[in-house]
């Protein structure tokens, strides 16, 4: 086991930290936008489950090294629509590639500090983070 | 603020947790299975993107009071193969419905010791998670 | 022992695109990210974007957004970049890094620890 | 993006100095810097990472410090095989940024 600057130093133990609790969603880093490439807008049949899927989606990296997880993987979709089964190429309009959003929980490295306001190390916050995971091929919402 | 028990219940802190880091892959409590119900096997035309899917799925709860998350959800696929477009119940055969792994972090509270194998309050354990986050409409694999 | 195998130099005319390999051996090819870096006149680093073999996760600078496409083949361990098209502005060294991971854990350090060769991409008509 | 600002492009030295090469950031970086070393033949390594963490393998003649947004490489004893262009890099954050390098010749 290895461990960060200790945010209570006791004799026991080689490093503790504090877990503050907020559940106050994160945005990304940046919003989770469609990235749509025409050469890549097809559904391959063969390769991992997101170039497989018809409504095929590429992973962008958002590190953050102050973050527990340090690296998330944002879901960009690659296509407006889906893709056809048959061809696995042409479009279908009659279905929307949309992005799967999740708030997972992380923790970010923070000053913690002493009662004097003296700094003891770090501590960690929880928070909710808006990640896109995926992208699904849905039906057009019908409004009533 | 709220918080679990202490691992080192110092003066200047409500709480500390000892985070000790393993990367070994915990199981999720139940298999992530396959769960078919034809009455269910549909995209709708409105409500959430699993139900809008052509993928549809539900979720499942997997609680765990020594995890954090505490709460964590399963997707189940409702159908073996992608629904059509066109009618948003019929099958259609050419297109897999597959389960989207991911290996999420999670945070296990264990008891931990002193330096003389004291109970010393609690401590979180980090494990990497499987979790089905989601069902895609994916073309099937052609072996080459 | 760590190497990264790089392919040879390339003569492209403008307007074409070119593929870069980076065979990697001696390590777990989906357990470290790979960098891709670009010098011009043997002088600036400039670094293109990364990818993460496991996934297909990548990373880029902003500007190699349509220049660079990058991807793996997980089965021969070999990282790939395929530039775009090609201008006299394109015509440098490209070189591939391993991303290491440090202690402590589990809030890394990352450093480019290994490196290729280089591969010297002229751009000419 | 970050901007890494090595002032020096060339310095030299004769064996045996003391040699100091700077780098600076448009921001504070919290000691997330790396150093690189590159060969004439254009060979490129890894000497220090986290300011001052030295690579395996680099002899203890190499140094790094530095905080904020001031950072330095020290190579305590000039060796003939240390003639190369050594270059910064950040990774406080996404995109990587790299100093203009810093070229140490033989007087």
């Known amino acids: 086991y290895s461990h960060w600057p200790s945010c209570c130093p006791s004799k026991g133990y080689p490093s503790e930290e504090l877990l503050r609790w907020s559940t106050v969603p994160v945005p990304p880093l940046k919003p989770a936008s469609l990235d749509f490439h025409s050469v890549s807008c097809r559904a391959s049949e063969d390769g991992p489950l997101n170039s497989r899927a018809i409504s095929p989606w590429r992973y962008e990296l958002d590190r953050d090294l102050n973050r527990l997880p340090q690296d998330l993987y944002h879901a960009r979709c690659l296509c407006p629509h889906c893709v056809s089964l048959q061809t696995g190429s042409h479009m279908d309009p009659r279905g929307n590639s949309e992005l799967l959003y999740h708030n997972q929980t992380v923790f970010y490295r923070r000053p913690c500090h002493g009662k004097k306001g003296n700094h003891k190390g770090y501590c960690l916050e929880r928070r909710l983070y808006r990640v896109s995971l995926a992208c699904v091929c849905v039906r057009p919402r019908v409004m009533g | 603020y709220s918080h679990w028990p202490s691992c080192c219940p110092s003066k200047g802190y409500p709480s500390e947790e000892l985070l000790r880091w393993s990367t070994v892959p915990v199981p999720p409590l139940k298999p992530a299975s396959l769960d078919f119900h034809s009455v269910s096997c549909r995209a709708s035309e409105d409500g959430p993107l699993n139900s809008r899917a052509i993928s549809p799925w539900r979720y499942e709860l997997d609680r765990d009071l020594n995890r954090l998350p505490q709460d964590l959800y399963h997707a189940r696929c409702l159908c073996p193969h992608c629904v059509s477009l066109q009618t948003g119940s019929h099958m259609d055969p050419r297109g897999n419905s597959e389960l989207l792994y991911h290996n999420q972090t999670v945070f296990y509270r264990r008891p931990c010791h002193g330096k003389k194998g004291n109970h010393k309050g609690y401590c979180l354990e980090r494990r990497l998670y499987r979790v089905s986050l989601a069902c895609v409409c994916v073309r099937p694999r052609v072996m080459g | 022992e760590v190497q990264l195998q790089q392919s040879g130099p390339e003569l492209v005319k403008p307007g074409g695109s070119v593929r870069i390999s980076c065979k990697a051996s001696g390590y777990s090819f989906t357990g470290y990210t790979m960098n891709w870096v670009k010098q011009s006149h043997g002088k600036n680093l400039e670094w293109i974007g990364l990818?993460?073999?496991?996934?297909?996760?990548?990373s880029h600078k902003q500007r190699f957004m349509g220049k660079a496409t990058l991807t793996v083949d997980k089965s021969s361990s070999t990282a790939y970049m395929e530039l775009l098209s090609l201008t006299s502005e394109d015509s440098a060294v490209y070189y591939c890094?391993?991303?290491?991971?440090?202690?402590?854990?589990?809030?890394?350090?990352?450093?480019?620890?290994?490196w290729g060769q280089g591969t010297s991409v002229t751009v000419s008509s | 993006d970050i901007q890494m600002t090595q002032t020096t492009s060339s310095l030299s030295a004769s064996l045996g100095d003391r040699v100091t090469i700077s780098c600076s950031a448009s921001q504070d970086i919290s000691n997330y810097l790396n150093w690189y070393q590159q060969k004439p033949d254009g060979t490129i390594k890894l000497l220090i990472y986290y300011t001052s963490t030295l690579h395996s393998g680099v002899p203890s003649r190499f140094s790094g410090s530095g905080s904020g947004t001031d950072y330095s490489l020290t190579i305590s004893n000039l060796e003939p095989e240390d003639i190369a262009t050594y270059y910064c890099?950040?990774?406080?954050?996404?995109?990587?940024?790299f100093g203009g390098g810093t070229k140490l010749e033989i007087k």
């Open positions: 890094a391993r991303e290491g991971y440090y202690g402590p854990s589990p809030f890394h350090h990352y450093a480019m620890d290994y």
């Open positions: 990818i993460n073999p496991d996934n297909g996760g990548t």
């Open positions: 890099q950040q990774y406080s954050k996404l995109p990587y940024t």
